[in-house]
Interface confidence: low
């Protein structure tokens, strides 16, 4: 009985972009300005997201889909659906509570976002360091020391002086 009733529900005929208006005898009414319904059979329309401040509009709201935001230059998106914008830093830096700071020795960041990370430890994979790491680049691992021809040298990266992202103590 329940299933039959739901199949006959007049609201199920209301397409996306409309809502089933109880105040008007369940007539399908268009979503008001700045609102949308992305599926049929909705009893209300959702308010469109507004991209303000550091957010900018990537896709305008329509009657059937919400607006999509991204971030103004110098910022990048975080979270599902770009729920937040965070300041960019340069490569070789990380964002701290005090702003952008250079990566500590033994760590790198090859992106404008995120944290400084420790150089790859080539020896864990039985390899040697072909190219030293920098603040902007990870070390490059090469063949294992045993695979190197006699007389060839390999560079071993020094241990990090301290780890990235320390809290101010």
């Amino acid at each position: 009985f329940e299933r039959t009733r739901s199949l006959q529900d007049p609201c199920s005929n209301c397409p996306a972009g409309t809502f089933c208006d109880n105040n008007r005898n369940q007539i399908c009414s268009p979503c008001p300005p700045n609102s949308f319904s992305s599926a049929g059979g909705q009893r209300t329309c959702d308010i469109c997201r507004q991209c303000k401040g550091v957010f900018r509009t990537r896709k305008e709201c329509s009657s059937t889909s919400n607006a999509e935001c991204d971030c103004t230059p110098g910022f990048h998106c975080l979270g599902a659906g770009c729920s937040m914008c965070e300041q960019d830093c340069k490569q070789g830096q990380e964002l701290t509570k005090k702003g952008c700071k250079d990566c500590c020795f033994g760590t790198f960041n090859d992106q404008k976002r995120g944290i400084c990370r420790p150089w790859t430890n080539c020896s864990l994979d039985g390899k040697s360091v072909l190219v030293n790491g920098t603040k902007e680049r990870d070390v490059v691992c090469g063949p294992s020391p045993a695979d190197l021809s006699p007389g060839a040298s390999s560079v071993t990266p020094p241990a990090p002086a301290r780890e990235p992202g320390h809290s101010p103590q």
Epitope: L78, A80, K97, D110, Q111, R113, P118, G165
Partner: antibody, heavy 116, light 111 residues
């Protein structure tokens, strides 16, 4: 829409290997590290390692060193996690998760069952 | 064994406030501001609720807040609602070879 879509459930025998994929969409694939985190039935979350999709560099938890390999294919915006020498205690849901300084986007999870 | 210690369970009535603790060491929670909290409903993937100790992603209710003192981080949920019932995990960056660690999880029951 930003999302991570993982491959389907797997059933493996002890000693075998499994390779799980995680396809990213809706953002710049090479701009964010990707991690793998697993969760055994009824248990907590366990970090396995990360891959830098930009360089291919990896960092694995000590527990998984020698058994796990993380790779990426930038042409398809996909990361892979291969775990070898499977044992029954590897039965778990395996999640990929995007990272900036926390895991802000997660895949839906891939159930891997190891059973003889 | 989880590296970060959380209570196995906490409970509260609707409208109340609860706090979940997450105790680590000077190698993880005590040294880094990269502490995050995740909510996980049964059969679902975890969801980020708090990052960088106390920052809340937009879309997450302001009833959720985070803090840290020494080696212990805390998640506080005020005005408990039925939908808050879930497992909660803390996580921190660490200086050990395991770069990220999780707590064992706390089951929150809304009475």
């Amino acid at each position: 829409e930003v999302q991570l879509v993982e491959s389907g459930a797997e059933v493996k025998k002890p000693g075998a290997s499994v390779k799980v994929s995680c396809k990213a969409s809706g953002y710049t694939f090479t701009g964010y590290y990707m991690h793998w985190v697993r969760q055994a039935p009824g248990q907590g979350l366990e970090w396995m390692g990360w891959i830098n999709p930009n360089s291919g560099g990896t960092n694995y938890a000590q527990k998984f060193q020698g058994r796990v390999t993380m790779t990426r294919d930038t042409s398809t915006s996909t990361v892979y996690m291969e775990l070898s020498s499977l044992r029954s205690e590897d039965t778990a849901v395996y999640y990929c998760a995007r990272d900036i300084r926390a895991f802000d986007i997660w895949g839906q999870g891939t159930m891997v069952t190891v059973s003889s | 064994q989880p590296v970060l210690t959380q209570p196995a369970s906490v409970s509260g009535s609707p409208g109340q406030s609860i706090t979940i603790s997450c105790t680590g060491t000077s190698s993880d929670v005590g040294s880094y501001n990269f502490v995050s909290w995740y909510q996980q409903h049964p059969g679902k993937a975890p969801k980020l609720m708090i990052y960088d100790v106390s920052n809340r992603p937009s879309g997450v209710s302001d009833r959720f807040s985070g803090s840290k003192s020494g080696n212990t981080a805390s998640l506080t949920i005020s005005g408990l609602q039925a939908e808050d019932e879930a497992d909660y995990y803390c996580s921190s960056y660490t200086s050990s070879s395991t770069r990220w660690v999780f707590g064992g999880g706390t089951k929150l029951t809304v009475l």
